[in-house]
Interface confidence: medium
């Protein structure tokens, strides 16, 4: 026999962004209390199985009223330890659930209202008689800091509280058949009274001649691991004494799941999937109705008014299992595309997208030009989730990687001659034509479109062409600048559109993932 002791050090907002709202306010003062539930072994720590090792409720903490505008501090805690007495041996491995409850002290009809603020759970190995173990657990935006230990109640001692000690019979030595009982100098260990052959590692006794087994072991002498069969499924080495193969630790051998439950192996143990109406580590708890509150984590129970009818738990987002006992890692479904990071907010999933992507699943490719996809000085033009390159003179192809002759396509009309130039191609027009591509006749209606040329300068002179080329270049530069401005504006609009779409589609994504 012994006592498990839990000391809560603090309960308050965890690190990082998104601090939780204070649970209490000036209008609704409240106080906290804690509940601890212990189960033997490395069982599933969800709340559905009974607290086989015991449970305890703390005292109520001091009344707390939030100070307006102040950051949520660590909340005032109840005094003292939570103590869970255990009658049998301490199992060495255990699962715990620690719940933080809020008691509202407003003028509720029918007394104060209770609501669950946070639940943390874990699996631990712990020897009785050892030092305090410290732990930090997070539940949503809350953080709980606590310490725990297991200690034996006299006359029990040892890491499992299974050895019995008696006071010394004489001041200087132990009585006949008794050995000194470390680490207590004034006590002596009782003689071994268990059944002959009872495993010293896996068995213990409280009465002479008995052999009781620790968690995970069975058989008359506690030498057989739980859920192994005799010699039908050989797994381990041969035993010289029995002449048959002793099964190794095959956790599902012999199916430890009762009441038609199916067993599946886990890295360290096994897990039972129970039929409706049964739960517990081995589906051993039966006859459940909605009145027993079998649905955990806020699950809604339907049916099961009489003991023979099954019940159904409708689980909230983020939980699954016949009792809503299993937390779903919804981000493991990889809902975010294109390398987005997934956040499970509880009520919804959120994808944080990489630069250049948007949408609830980061499925929209916003910015294909961000990767400088156009070579050799080409300009990237976005559109429709794809990109194309407007290539510099002398280059072509999808990414402007191919050398190109700008005059190959014969761009100069009316017999104009084409010249490649660093700023673009230049057309030297035949007499009687003008324009960037020699597309305009000089005398469209018989009258000169240009003032008469100064004496000594004919329409085909190079100076005239150069002036025309400079004018064309100026127009092109203005057009490019205008294009860039339009591009920037349209990009901003598109980003805004995707942000709106992202907010709108979050709900749809949330419903789809729940389905």
């Amino acid at each position: 026999a012994g006592v498990f002791e839990l000391q809560i050090h603090s309960f308050g907002p965890g690190p990082g962004p998104g601090a939780p709202r204070s649970p209490c306010s000036a209008r609704l003062p409240c106080r906290l209390f804690f509940r601890v539930c212990l189960k033997p072994g490395l069982s599933e720590e969800a709340a559905e199985s009974p607290c086989a090792l015991g449970a305890a409720l703390s005292a109520r903490g001091p009344v707390y009223t939030e100070q307006p505008g102040a950051p949520a501090p660590d909340l005032p805690l109840p005094d003292g330890l939570l103590q869970v007495p255990f009658r049998d041996a301490w199992p060495g491995t255990f699962s715990f659930i620690i719940e933080t409850w809020r008691e509202e002290l407003g003028d509720q009809i029918g007394g104060p209202a209770w609501s669950l603020l946070a639940r943390v759970a874990g699996r631990r190995r712990l020897a009785a008689g050892g030092p305090w173990a410290r732990d930090i657990q997070r539940a949503g935006a809350w953080e709980l800091r606590f310490s725990y230990r297991a200690r034996c109640e006299p006359p029990a001692v040892g890491t499992a509280c299974t050895r019995l000690c008696r006071p010394r019979s004489a001041p200087s030595r132990c009585g006949p058949g008794l050995r000194p009982c470390a680490p207590l100098e004034d006590e002596c260990e009782a003689p071994l009274v268990c059944r002959a052959g009872c495993s010293p590692e896996h068995g213990f006794c409280e009465q002479p001649g008995e052999c009781r087994c620790l968690e995970g072991w069975t058989g008359p002498l506690c030498t057989v691991p739980v859920s192994t069969s005799s010699c039908l499924s050989p797994r381990g080495p041969s035993s010289a004494t029995t002449g048959c193969l002793v099964p190794g630790p095959g956790p599902c051998d012999g199916n430890p799941c009762a009441n038609g439950g199916s067993c599946s192996e886990t890295p360290r143990s096994f897990e039972c999937t129970c039929p409706r109406g049964f739960y517990g580590l081995r589906c051993e708890v039966s006859g459940v109705t909605c009145a027993d509150g079998p649905c955990f984590n806020g699950g809604l129970c339907v049916g099961g008014a009489d003991p023979d009818s099954a019940y159904i738990c409708h689980c909230p987002p983020g939980f699954q299992g016949s009792n809503c006992e299993k937390r779903v890692d919804r981000c493991s479904l990889q809902p975010c595309r294109n390398g987005g990071l997934c956040l499970d907010l509880g009520h919804a999933l959120r994808c944080r997208c990489r630069a250049g992507f948007a949408g609830p699943r980061c499925e929209h490719d916003l910015d294909d030009c961000a990767g400088r996809a156009c070579a050799n000085g080409g300009t990237c033009v976005e559109g429709g989730g794809a990109h194309r390159c407007s290539c510099a003179l002398g280059f072509g192809g999808r990414d402007c990687r191919e050398r190109a002759d700008p005059c190959a396509a014969r761009p100069c009309a009316h017999g104009g001659r084409c010249y490649a130039h660093f700023s673009g191609l230049v057309c030297a027009c035949a007499p009687g034509y003008m324009g960037a591509r020699c597309e305009f006749p000089v005398h469209p209606d018989g009258a000169s479109a240009l003032p008469a040329a100064p004496p000594g300068l004919r329409p085909g002179d190079p100076q005239r062409y150069l002036a025309g080329v400079i004018a064309v270049i100026v127009v092109v530069v203005i057009a490019i600048v205008a294009g860039i401005v339009v591009l920037v504006i349209s990009r901003k609009k598109r980003m805004a559109k995707y942000e709106k779409a992202e907010i709108k589609e979050m709900g749809e994504m949330h419903r789809e993932l729940n389905a």
Epitope: P17, Q334, R337, N338, G339, A370, G371
Partner: antibody
Amino acid sequence: EVQLVQSGAEVKKPGASVKVSCKASGYTFTSYWMHWVRQAPGQRLEWMGVIDPSDSLANYNQEFKGRVTLTVDTSASTAYMELSSLRSEDTAVYYCARDSTVVAPMDYWGQGTTVTVSS
Amino acid sequence: DIVMTQSPDSLAVSLGERATINCRATKSISKYLAWYQQKPGQTNKLLIFSGSTLQSGVPDRFSGSGSGTDFTLTISSLQAEDVAVYYCQQHHEYPYTFGGGTKVEIK
């Protein structure tokens, strides 16, 4: 110049844990995500996970079944990868690699840290 | 998870000749494929991402093509410094996965 400098080689026993560090310089540490990749002898590269140093949001490869923990110390511009319950098959070179903010996944890599798991 | 299969495992090409490495994904990854170069004693180097985009500072003898499930890395004129192991990697979805690598040597 962007640089990722990793901690030195480690020899560990099975069941132990190892923590590899990756010190970043030459850029704003919190503006780029950090990936961790490993390569066992003669094997392909294997992605382990990614962390956003701005708020420690991470995404892990489920293959590692909760054995990997990625953390950062923004004040020291350092990322950490801890791998627990080591087995002999965890013997590998472990790399940190910066995530480009564009569409390139890993544009700068650390030099690698050799972790040997042996009894 | 998406499995990436690279071929061939190794490749011997004469200096100045073309080297071609293929990479196939078990499902469509759109254009989201990267190529890396791994040399002993050096940090891994990103060559190409998004299937065909050359990383800044990478010589233009390297080029990438393909989309969906089939991709190709081409070294148009192999140089002595190109001797290395080349890996493809999908960056379409987590977990990111790599090909088995192709060792390129000089014939």
